[in-house]
C-alpha cells in the first residue's frame, strides 16, 4: 500500500492576507484566519512530517480584494510559486481580465502546471496559449507517479470574459479521453482537479472511469467529519464518498473558500492504484497557526502599492451620489442605480445572437449601501470612497430565479416599509410599482422587467413561471435581510466579482458619471 496526502485549496479569491472569521478584512489580528503566510506554515509542517504530499488548488485564485484589482494576477503567481503549489485548475474567475489577463500574469509566470481538459483554444489563440495550460500533468510523488487532470465550469463564458477563441466543453465528455490517455501511459493513480461545483464533482466521480479522487471548487462547499471548528455548516462528510458507475468508492473533496481552511486528505492506494482508504478533514487556519515570517514580510512589501492605490482617482461624478439610508431604504436612490448599472455592465456577455445580453436585471438591498459620495470634492471618486459605500467585501453574483420568487422578493422589499429597514430593493432593468395601502405580501401592483431575448430592450410584465437571470449581492443570494425565498428557491447560483471592483471598473470605464433617479421604483395610491 502507498499513502498520498492531498492538501488542497479552492476559491481563495485574492485573500492573500489573513481575514476575519467571515473572510472580510482582518480587524483583530488575534482572531484572524487564513492568508498565504499562515497557509505556508501549515503546508511546510505537513511536508516535513509526511512523505508523499501534493498541494493543489482547484481554481478561482483571481478576484475578490484590492490585491487582484491592483496586481491583476501577478500576486497569485508570485505567492503560489512561493508556497510551491504542485498544480492548479483554471476557475471561471481566472478569465475575468480576459485571456491576456490570464496568460501574462499567471500562465507565463507560474512554476507549476495549470490545468483544464475541457477548455479548447481555437483560431489565433491556439498557438499563443499552446503549452501554457495543459489538460493533465503527471507528477512524480516519491517513488510513484500521480496524474492530475483539470476541468473548468462550462458556464465560464456566462460568468467571465474568456473571449471567443476558447471553447468550454462538457466536463465529463472532455475528461474521459484524457483519463484514458493517462491509463495508457501506465498512470494508475488519477486525481480530477477542477472548478465546476460540487454537483459536477460528484458526477465526475460517478461517470468518469479511472478517476480515483475528485478535488473540486466553485460552489464553496464545506465538508467535514465530526464537529466543525468554525461557523461553516458541513454539506456532508469529508471526504464525500461517491459510488462510481463501475462500482468504485470515489472520495470527493472541497475546502470551502477564501483560504480559511486547508483541505487535508489522506489516500491509501494498493499496488494497482485502487483506493483502499481515504480520510481527513479541512484544517482551520486560525491564529493558533503562526504566520510564516518570510512570507509575511513579502506580503507587507507588496501591500505598500495597495495603500497608494486606494487614494488615486478612479473617475469623476458631476452629481451627488445619494447613498444615504434616508433615500436608499425608502425610495429609488441614484447610488443604487449607479451600482446596479455597474453590476449589469460587468456582466455584458454577447454569447448568443438571439440575446443582446444574457442578463438584464439587478437587485440590491438598500441596507447594503452604506454611504453617499459628495461631488463637491472636485468630483473625485477613489477606491477609499467606494469602500465606504460597500464596506462588507461581498460579491455581485449571478442567480437564476423564477418570476414567482422575484415577485416574493419585491413583496418582501416593502413588507414593513417606513421603518428604515435594509430590505428595500434598489434595482436595474426592473420597473416596480408599489401600493403601500395594500397589505404586506400584496403591495406589488406592477413589475416589469427588461427583455434579454430582444434586439431593442424593452420592459415587459414579469411572468411567474419564467426563469430569469438576476445579478445581486451574495448577501441576498444567501438569504440575507430576510430574503429567505431567494436562498430557498434559486435554481442556480454562481459567485461573481468583488463588489467594489465592479463599481470601480465601471467608473473608470465611464470616466464621468451622472446617475439619475429615473422612475425605476414608483409608488401608487390605491383605495386601500
Amino acid at each position: 500500500a502507498w499513502e498520498l496526502t492531498i492538501l488542497h485549496t479552492n476559491d481563495v479569491h485574492s485573500r492573500l492576507e489573513q481575514t476575519s472569521e467571515d473572510s472580510s478584512k482582518c480587524v483583530n489580528a488575534s482572531r484572524c484566519m487564513g492568508g498565504v503566510a499562515r497557509l505556508f506554515t501549515k503546508v511546510q509542517q505537513i511536508r516535513r512530517a509526511e512523505p508523499n504530499v501534493l498541494l493543489l488548488d482547484a481554481g478561482d485564485q483571481y478576484q475578490g480584494t484590492i490585491w487582484f484589482t491592483v496586481y491583476k494576477g501577478a500576486e497569485v503567481a508570485h505567492f503560489m510559486n512561493a508556497l510551491r503549489y504542485d498544480a492548479m485548475a483554471l476557475g471561471n474567475h481566472e478569465f475575468d481580465n480576459g485571456v491576456e489577463g490570464l496568460i501574462e500574469p499567471l500562465l507565463k509566470e507560474a512554476k507549476f502546471p495549470i490545468l483544464s481538459a475541457n477548455i479548447k483554444a481555437k483560431g489565433p489563440l491556439a498557438s499563443q496559449i499552446s503549452g501554457l495550460y495543459l489538460p493533465y500533468k503527471v507528477l512524480p510523488v516519491g517513488d510513484e507517479v500521480v496524474g492530475i487532470v483539470g476541468y473548468t465550469s462550462k458556464e465560464t463564458p456566462f460568468l467571465s470574459n474568456p473571449g471567443t477563441n476558447l471553447v468550454f466543453e462538457d466536463e465529463i465528455t472532455a475528461l474521459q479521453p484524457e483519463v484514458d490517455k493517462l491509463k495508457t501511459l501506465n498512470v494508475n493513480k488519477i486525481i480530477a482537479l477542477g472548478h465546476s461545483g460540487f454537483e459536477m464533482d460528484k458526477l465526475i466521480a460517478q461517470k468518469v472511469r479511472g478517476v480515483d479522487v475528485v478535488v473540486g471548487g466553485h460552489s464553496n462547499t464545506f465538508l467535514y467529519t465530526g464537529n466543525p471548528p468554525s461557523k461553516e455548516v458541513p454539506a456532508g462528510k469529508y471526504p464525500f464518498i461517491v459510488t462510481s458507475d463501475d462500482g468504485r468508492k470515489v472520495p470527493v473533496v472541497q475546502a470551502y473558500a477564501f483560504g480559511k481552511y486547508l483541505g487535508y486528505l489522506k489516500i491509501e492506494f494498493d499496488e494497482r492504484g485502487n483506493v483502499i482508504s481515504s480520510h481527513g478533514n479541512p484544517i482551520l487556519l486560525n491564529s493558533s497557526i503562526p504566520e510564516d515570517p518570510s512570507i509575511k514580510a513579502d506580503i507587507n512589501k507588496w501591500r505598500i502599492k495597495l495603500d497608494n492605490y486606494s487614494t488615486q482617482e478612479l473617475g469623476k461624478t458631476i452629481v451627488y451620489l445619494d447613498g444615504s439610508s434616508q433615500s436608499c431604504r425608502f425610495r429609488e436612490c441614484n447610488m443604487g442605480n449607479l451600482i446596479c448599472d455597474a453590476m449589469i455592465n460587468n456582466n455584458l456577455r454577447h454569447t448568443d445572437e438571439m440575446f443582446w445580453n444574457h442578463v438584464s436585471m439587478c437587485i440590491l438591498n438598500g441596507g447594503g449601501i452604506r454611504s453617499p459620495i459628495d461631488e463637491r470634492n472636485n468630483g473625485t471618486i477613489t477606491w477609499e470612497n467606494l469602500a465606504a459605500v460597500l464596506p462588507f467585501g461581498g460579491t455581485f453574483d449571478l442567480v437564476q430565479l423564477k418570476g414567482s420568487t422575484l415577485k416574493k422578493a419585491f413583496e418582501h422589499s416593502v413588507h414593513r416599509y417606513g421603518q428604515s429597514t435594509g430590505e428595500f430593493l434598489q434595482v436595474g432593468g426592473i420597473h416596480v410599482v408599489y401600493d403601500l395601502s395594500r397589505k404586506p405580501g400584496d403591495r406589488v401592483v406592477k413589475l416589469d422587467v427588461l427583455c434579454t431575448k430582444c434586439r431593442v430592450p424593452s420592459y415587459d410584465p414579469l411572468k411567474m413561471d419564467e426563469v430569469y437571470k438576476v445579478i445581486l449581492p451574495n448577501f441576498l443570494a444567501n438569504g440575507g435581510d430576510g430574503f429567505q425565498m431567494i436562498k430557498d428557491e434559486l435554481l442556480r447560483h454562481d459567485s461573481g466579482d468583488q463588489d467594489i471592483n465592479v463599481v470601480s471598473t465601471y467608473i473608470s470605464k465611464m470616466k464621468v458619471i451622472y446617475p439619475a433617479v429615473e422612475g425605476r421604483i414608483k409608488f401608487s395610491t390605491g383605495s386601500h
Epitope: 418582501h412 413588507h415 397589505k439 405580501g441 429567505q484 386601500h528
Partner: antibody
C-alpha cells in the same frame, strides 16, 4: 356594525362545483380584503383565498387550480367557486373581512366573520 | 408555505389559572402573527394582531408576545367564557397559515 351573511349549497356530489356567496352589510367594501377560510370536521383552519374591491385575487397555492373568487361591488357581495370537489373538501366554509389594524397598516387580521356554511361532499 | 406549530394541542385548567399557549413558525415572520379564539359551532374571533396588540373589545387578560419564530398567547386569569380552542395565524408572507389549534378545557 359590519356583518357578513353567507349562503350556498350544502350538499354536493364528487366532481361538482361548490358555490358560495357572502354579502357585506353595514360597512365599506373598499379598503379591505375579503377572504374565504374552511375548517374540515374536527380539524383546523385553512385559508382558501381573498379578493379586494377591484377584483385582485390571491389564492392558496394548494387550491389555486380549482378556486375562483369573484366580486360584485354593486351588490357588496363576493363569491367562492371550488371545482371538482371530493370528500376531502367537506368542511365548514367561512367568509371573512381582513382589514388593516393599528396605526401603521402593517398588520392585517380577519376581524369580521360570516356565520359559516357546512358543505358536505358525498356520493 | 410557512408551517405554524402550536403547543400544547390541548390543556386542562381551572378558572383563575394563568394559561400560556405557544406558537412556532417554520421561518421568521417578524411580528405578523394573529391569535383567534373559536368556540364550538361558532366562527373564530380575532383576539390579538401584530403578535402583541389587543383587538378592540377583547378583555385585557389576553396578551400576546414574541417575534421572529416564537410567539406566546397568555391568559392571565382564566374565566369561564375563555374555554375554547385558540389558533395562531401568520399573516405574511402569503399564503396565510394557521396553527393546529390548542383546546383549553375545564379541569
Amino acid at each position: 356594525q359590519v356583518q357578513l351573511q353567507q349562503w350556498g349549497a350544502g350538499l354536493l356530489k364528487p366532481s361538482e362545483t361548490l358555490s358560495l356567496t357572502c354579502a357585506v352589510y353595514g360597512g365599506s367594501f373598499s379598503g379591505y380584503y375579503w377572504s374565504w377560510i374552511r375548517q374540515p370536521p374536527g380539524k383546523g383552519l385553512e385559508w382558501i383565498g381573498e379578493i379586494d374591491h377591484s377584483g385582485s385575487t390571491n389564492y392558496n397555492p394548494s387550491l389555486k387550480s380549482r378556486v375562483t373568487i369573484s366580486v360584485d361591488t354593486s351588490k357588496n357581495q363576493f363569491s367562492l367557486k371550488l371545482s371538482s370537489v371530493t370528500a376531502a373538501d367537506t368542511a365548514v366554509y367561512y367568509c371573512a373581512r381582513e382589514g388593516g389594524l393599528g396605526e401603521d397598516y402593517y398588520y392585517y387580521g380577519m376581524d369580521v366573520w360570516g356565520q359559516g356554511t357546512t358543505v358536505t361532499v358525498s356520493s | 408555505d410557512i408551517q405554524m406549530t402550536q403547543s400544547p394541542s390541548s390543556l386542562s385548567a381551572s378558572v383563575g389559572d394563568r394559561v400560556t399557549i405557544t406558537c412556532r413558525a417554520s421561518q421568521s415572520i417578524s411580528s405578523y402573527l394573529n391569535w383567534y379564539q373559536q368556540k364550538p359551532g361558532k366562527a373564530p374571533k380575532l383576539l390579538i394582531y401584530g403578535a402583541s396588540s389587543l383587538q378592540s373589545g377583547v378583555p385585557s387578560r389576553f396578551s400576546g408576545s414574541g417575534s421572529g419564530t416564537d410567539f406566546t398567547l397568555t391568559i392571565s386569569s382564566l374565566q369561564p367564557e375563555d374555554f375554547a380552542t385558540y389558533y395562531c395565524q401568520q399573516q405574511y408572507p402569503l399564503p396565510p397559515t394557521f396553527g393546529g389549534g390548542t383546546k383549553v378545557e375545564i379541569k
